[in-house]
Amino acid sequence: YSNFRKSMDSVGRKQYQVQHGSCSYTFLLPETDNCRSSSSPYVSNAVQRDAPLDYDDSVHRLQVLESIMENNTQWLMKLENYIQDNMKKEMVEIQQNAVQNQTAVMIEIGTNLLNQTAEQTRKLTDVEAQVLNQTTRLELQLLEHSLSTNKLEKQILDQTSEINKLQDKNSFLEKKVLDMEDKHIVQLQSIKEEKDQLQVLVSKQNSIIEELERQLVTATVNNSALQKQQHDLTETVHSLLTMIATSSSAKNSFAAKEEQITFRDCADVFRSGLTTSGIYTLTFPNSTEETKAYCDMETGGGGWTTIQRREDGSVDFQRTWKEYKVGFGNPSGEHWLGNEFVSQLTNQQRYVLKIHLRDWEGNEAYSLYEHFYLSSEEFNYRIHLKGLTGTAGKISSISQPGNDFSTKDADNDKCICKCSQMLTGGWWFDACGPSNLNGMYYPQRQNTNKFNGIKWYYWKGSGYSLKATTMMIRPADF
């Protein structure tokens, strides 16, 4: 035997051809390409999917497999018949020719055919196993689908029942809401009536408070006047006693009395025995000119002459040079005592300056300068300060060295701008400097990011406008 070839026919089927001398034996075997390889996701011994396959797909694949099986069975039958027929013919030929080597060829062919048949049978067994596996899976899936359907039906029934319950509950709640609405309308009506009554009451109370405030101011003024009268009377009695004792002339006695009740500052008032805070009349040094000032007799031992106060925004501080010179406002409230008086006073002896500050959050701080004086008007009431202590910043918020005083009509600052016009109020502006206690008064919640407010930079920063400020002076030797 010369050779053994394996090839494909025109329709793609496998064919085995044995050539022996002049004889050629060709065997056509059934095709198995429709049977998927083990790499296919549908083969039983491949890794199975987690989710079940689509039911229709599974049925379709089952039908395909059945068709393949039928094909294979038919091929096998054909093959058996073919082998039997050929065997008969070959046996006759062998008997006729009785050639030894031909028999050997036939035995080989038979062996090949048997091997081929065994292979086909094994493949068919495989396919059967796959089909069985697929069928079992489909049965399981069908069972799962059936269970799922039952479960869904039960859920739908439960939900329907729940919806009915909710509808009943909703109807009940709607009724309740309607009842409540009626009650609410009645309540609102009564609240509105109460509100109107309260408004009337508040208006009355406001009127009473205003009247009381007026009375309080009057009482304060009267109190100060009475204190002064009491002091005058004490002095008069004292003078009379002295006059009787020494038999001095009445004229000298009354002159002494007049000298005694002249106060230069609040320290004088305090030393005279008048230790109640309030408004007192002070006399300019070396002059008969008078001014009214508020004396603080409580803070740090008392004797403080108040030269500035801000507390409620009731007084406009955007004033002229002349107004800042002589002073303005109410000494018991917001006011500026007057640059001329302060200048004359602080040039007589050494004074300390205390600045008391309050923010909108309830915090308080102070700056104390151990030496303070103002130059005369000729030098634009320039401020001079030395020796800072206190809680309102380690650095002075009044620029050092001191600057001239500026007002809206007297621009004495170091800015290309007009600080007094820009920031409002009269102050010892630099360019324009870290402070201005005479700026615009801004109420709470409107007091930030304001560069023309009441500013003390080294305590509250740039744009914070303070709630209250007091500037007061006292002799350094008090």
Partner: antibody
Framework: QVQLVESGGGVVQPGRSLRLSCAAS????????MHWVRQAPGKCLEWVAV????????YYVDSVKGRFTISRDNSKNTLYLQMNSLRAEDTAVYYC????????????????WGQGTLVTVS | EIVLTQSPGTLSLSPGERATLSCRAS???????LAWYQQKPGQAPRLLIT???SWATGIPDRFSGSGSGTDFTLTISRLEPEDFAVYYC?????????FGCGTRLEIK
Amino acid sequence: QVQLVESGGGVVQPGRSLRLSCAASGFTFTNYGMHWVRQAPGKCLEWVAVISHEGNNKYYVDSVKGRFTISRDNSKNTLYLQMNSLRAEDTAVYYCAREGIDFWSGLNWFDPWGQGTLVTVS
Amino acid sequence: EIVLTQSPGTLSLSPGERATLSCRASQSITGSYLAWYQQKPGQAPRLLITGASSWATGIPDRFSGSGSGTDFTLTISRLEPEDFAVYYCQQYSSSPITFGCGTRLEIK
């Protein structure tokens, strides 16, 4: 005499960086907020950024946020503008300017201004 | 942001004449926080007016500012040859600070 002198301008490619400087003299630098203002050729003036006198507060125009950084060295009396990820639209003359009022930072007028430095992004 | 619109874009006048420059804001400028600047070619802007009407130091009184709310005016009573330049308005009432695009004052 109050003076501001800018430097650091030049031609730069898009996406690259540049740092501008502004040397101040003739005034108490630590008391003033400082600004950068720019002017594109033949266009309007545009405020760019401000830094407070202490250097703790900084504000920028939206178009440069995240790309430009304003800073100052009070010991050297110098203001800086670090410009990253530059774009063609950043081409302009950059001026440094002092606030008109000291001890204030943010909303203010400007006086004086520097002579400007040209930045070309191309 | 507040947009400032300046008009006219260009104003052609002769020396000695009166110039009126307008600056209109898209919303009210609180506190009249408006400044005016003069800019000559190749130079930095120079401050003229702050607070809508206050002269900066050293500015001649022929320059005057007025207005409040949304309408502001810069007036030059008698034009001098050195007054021909570009004039800008700037608001510092709300963030961000904004400028107008300028009015060019040229010799007729």
